[in-house]
Amino acid sequence: SQVSQNCHNGSYEISVLMMGNSAFAEPLKNLEDAVNEGLEIVRGRLQNAGLNVTVNATFMYSDGLIHNSGDCRSSTCEGLDLLRKISNAQRMGCVLIGPSCTYSTFQMYLDTELSYPMISAGSFGLSCDYKETLTRLMSPARKLMYFLVNFWKTNDLPFKTYSWSTSYVYKNGTETEDCFWYLNALEASVSYFSHELGFKVVLRQDKEFQDILMDHNRKSNVIIMCGGPEFLYKLKGDRAVAEDIVIILVDLFNDQYFEDNVTAPDYMKNVLVLTLSPGNSLLNSSFSRNLSPTKRDFALAYLNGILLFGHMLKIFLENGENITTPKFAHAFRNLTFEGYDGPVTLDDWGDVDSTMVLLYTSVDTKKYKVLLTYDTHVNKTYPVDMSPTFTWKNSKLPNDITGRGPQ
Amino acid sequence: SQVSQNCHNGSYEISVLMMGNSAFAEPLKNLEDAVNEGLEIVRGRLQNAGLNVTVNATFMYSDGLIHNSGDCRSSTCEGLDLLRKISNAQRMGCVLIGPSCTYSTFQMYLDTELSYPMISAGSFGLSCDYKETLTRLMSPARKLMYFLVNFWKTNDLPFKTYSWSTSYVYKNGTETEDCFWYLNALEASVSYFSHELGFKVVLRQDKEFQDILMDHNRKSNVIIMCGGPEFLYKLKGDRAVAEDIVIILVDLFNDQYFEDNVTAPDYMKNVLVLTLSPGNSLLNSSFSRNLSPTKRDFALAYLNGILLFGHMLKIFLENGENITTPKFAHAFRNLTFEGYDGPVTLDDWGDVDSTMVLLYTSVDTKKYKVLLTYDTHVNKTYPVDMSPTFTWKNSKLPNDITGRGPQ
């Protein structure tokens, strides 16, 4: 049922759900700092626009009475719990900075009629797609899936002359929250990825993965996995790998590949890394000093969530429109706003668009080099290195099925 | 975290979660009546055993602030919500009469360390199997699955001389809660049923089901569905059905088939109905006057939950044992107690055992007749009618694959 909102008469409140369970193991204090930094910027922007209003955040903490704290696997009801707490206290703001856990967000939409805008730094799963009042500020699984299908089909680049239609997916259940949902989406039999591929098998055991690397009877040369180089090394070690194996390592929220002094270890030579185009603005930010690269993206998403609210608030106030309406709740999509780190584009469903970057290891320099970029907004690939110094034969990506000629 | 229990010094309380979302659309007032009737019996039994103690129930109602009320699909967090309410009020009893919805029960075990015994009239799904402190008093999906595998393999009865290894499953998403989880279990690729079958396809559209009935290229003659005769008629109507089609209609909680004046409609001739051996004790009960046959089972499970608690309380008190211990929480299994309707047996995992009955329509009398019974406790089938007057050729169930001879 509807709760009155602290969201009128020049006073606008943001309800921030501070969950014990989170997509990334980030101290809540850091997220508070990110929100507060965002608030400072929003207040400045509103004042700059001649809007003399008050914008504050209320941090709603779980009491820990019921929920096992930790990762997202036991988070399903925590968001609803906090929503009930807000409802009981009649402290609903204009917007919810909601759970980052897919289970939790999905449950909030399943169990309630959410007529408030909700902004999430996470909620990666396909089950959170197409929610009319949900905005997601970290690349959701659907975006990854569309890249992979696009890349698999590509056959007109100097370094990729074969369409692919097969894949192995390595998924052992120990993944981080982002990886868990990315791989879930690839595994789902009804997903776009599965629909477009002719063959796809999920490898769940380390041994299955290790065996495939040299198996002459393998059904695909391509293996998708998710995590960092260390994760791959733990699994692959220094094992020999057949020359036409391609490992796609999804590691979106890690910009270490772009640091100057980084050398790619030898075991990365058969690997293409998919990551996001790097940002650097948080390096000197007051709240980001102790953040790892991944957590930088997480904290940045919280900060950008505040800036997005400020952007929408400014537009509605300038147009003399009411904030506590369905129109406001449904407006957080199909737009570009100024994030902390530059413009942020949201698609028609409120999901962040970004530039994904596919990296390879140069056999000459042992450095990570950009092979191509992909714009999720237009679902288009842009080749960058037309003559990559690959490990693969003829500096071309192999066919996905050994012994199959050009199609 | 643990909450102090109202469960000592001669005063023993039962916490009954009265959910807005429920497995069966049963007025909560009727469930209260069932609980109160059970309490009267328990008090009498304890007094009769010379145990002068107080036993009461506290009914914990959802406030409806957050949750969409209705069926179980939006119930996931309601149980946890009530548990939080109990925790905050420090009103935990010795035992929880818990949610009937699978999602809700599963979530309570996922998100918390439940060290209280929980008794459920429902929680049918496989995800609630093997919970160490959960007792389920209505046949869970695992029991159905074991019957089906047993029956499929059977090939030594006069009326079933073929082992089956294939099936269609009709599942269109509009099922009642019990059916939803029964069919989910059959659909699950990792379930015992799927593991034991060579071919299984889920039909999700009415048209798919209707087409199979006369499709010469069908891969199986057997179709499992869940619901009552009316549900089947709405789907099948008076369409012609190939002579070797067998429809298995799962309708466990419906004893109308056993009423004297019931005639089987013509469209049921190709159908075997799986139901539970009927009870009649509730017909004259004060709380059951307005109950439909299905709801009789639901209310009875609540009543039996109270009797089960009384049974365990009596044993522990007579042995001088503490009630607020893990031993008590884990004791509600591998036992038989006196239910309202006769002895009730719980298996090693706290799930109710029962006698399932497979009915066919006699082509002579147009009556439902018992073909066989199945004891879930020993996983054994007992033929009843050795010369059934079937619609099928030679009064034998056909092979599951047309044209395949004896195996």
């Epitope: 910027i41 922007r45 700059n48 626009a49 001649g50 809007l51 000197n284 300038e318 100024e338 530059g342 | -």
Partner: antibody, heavy 119, light 107 residues
Framework: QVQLQQWGAGLLKPSETLSLTCAVF????????WSWIRQPPGKGLEWIGE???????NDNPSLKSRVTISVDTSKNQFALKLSSVTAADTAVYYC?????????????WGQGTLVTVSS | EIVMTQSPATLSVSPGERATLSCRAS??????LAWYQQKPGQAPRLLIY???TRATGIPARFSGSGSGTEFTLTIGSLQSEDFAVYYC?????????FGQGTNVEIK
């Protein structure tokens, strides 16, 4: 105290490319958009375009096809190139900092560079 | 683009008097409007933003008002250092646009 110091060629022939650079001293570079604004002699101010530390730009459509604004974060510098200049491009060119990120008004200005286009 | 029109082009005022400068936008800019002062040979200086908020270090005699399309800059009591050209600028949308300026001269 933030200071903007700009330099570049002051005299150009028609069809040449104007090239100016602005260096930022004493303040954060990443938290702002950095603009170029020009003022023809005896006339008003015209906004040319802006860039942030990530290289995201917004340009004035009236000049867009000829304008390139770039950034070098390692040096805290940004630059303007205006191709195919004509006499109409004669102006004092200012670099300026927005008062805050995306604020759109300018609280710190360079000293200005007079660029004359003459054959 | 949004066209900004200032009036009058020139305003002659005696020291100590009040000066009122007008700025009109071709479409609503809400309150996304700034005023600048420019003296000969110098870069412009930000006076007002948000239509009415004084920038850091700007004396109280400068005040701004208005919203939507009509804006006013008022200089309460003109000092000798206030004689200059004043520009309004909108920043509601891109491209940022300036008025053509009002020259405040000594009467």
């Amino acid at each position: 105290q933030v200071q903007l110091q700009q330099w570049g060629a002051g005299l150009l022939k028609p069809s040449e490319t104007l090239s100016l650079t602005c260096a930022v001293f004493g303040g954060s570079f990443s938290g702002y958009y950095w603009s170029w604004i020009r003022q023809p002699p005896g006339k008003g101010l015209e906004w040319i375009g802006e860039i942030n530390h990530r290289g995201n730009t917004n340009d004035n459509p009236s000049l867009k096809s000829r304008v390139t604004i770039s950034v070098d974060t390692s040096k805290n510098q940004f630059a303007l190139k205006l191709s195919s200049v004509t006499a109409a491009d004669t102006a004092v060119y200012y670099c300026a900092r927005e008062r805050g990120y995306t604020y759109g008004n300018f609280d710190h200005w360079g000293q200005g560079t007079l660029v004359t286009v003459s054959s | 683009e949004i066209v900004m029109t200032q009036s009058p082009a020139t305003l002659s005022v005696s020291p100590g008097e009040r000066a009122t400068l007008s700025c009109r936008a071709s479409q609503s800019v809400s309150r996304n409007l700034a005023w600048y002062q420019q003296k000969p040979g110098q870069a412009p200086r930000l006076l007002i933003y948000g239509a009415s908020t004084r920038a850091t270090g700007i004396p109280a005699r400068f005040s701004g008002s208005g919203s939507g399309t009509e804006f006013t800059l008022t200089i309460g009591s003109l000092q000798s250092e206030d004689f200059a050209v004043y520009y309004c600028q909108q920043y509601k949308t891109w491209p940022r646009t300036f008025g053509q300026g009002t020259n405040v001269e000594i009467k």
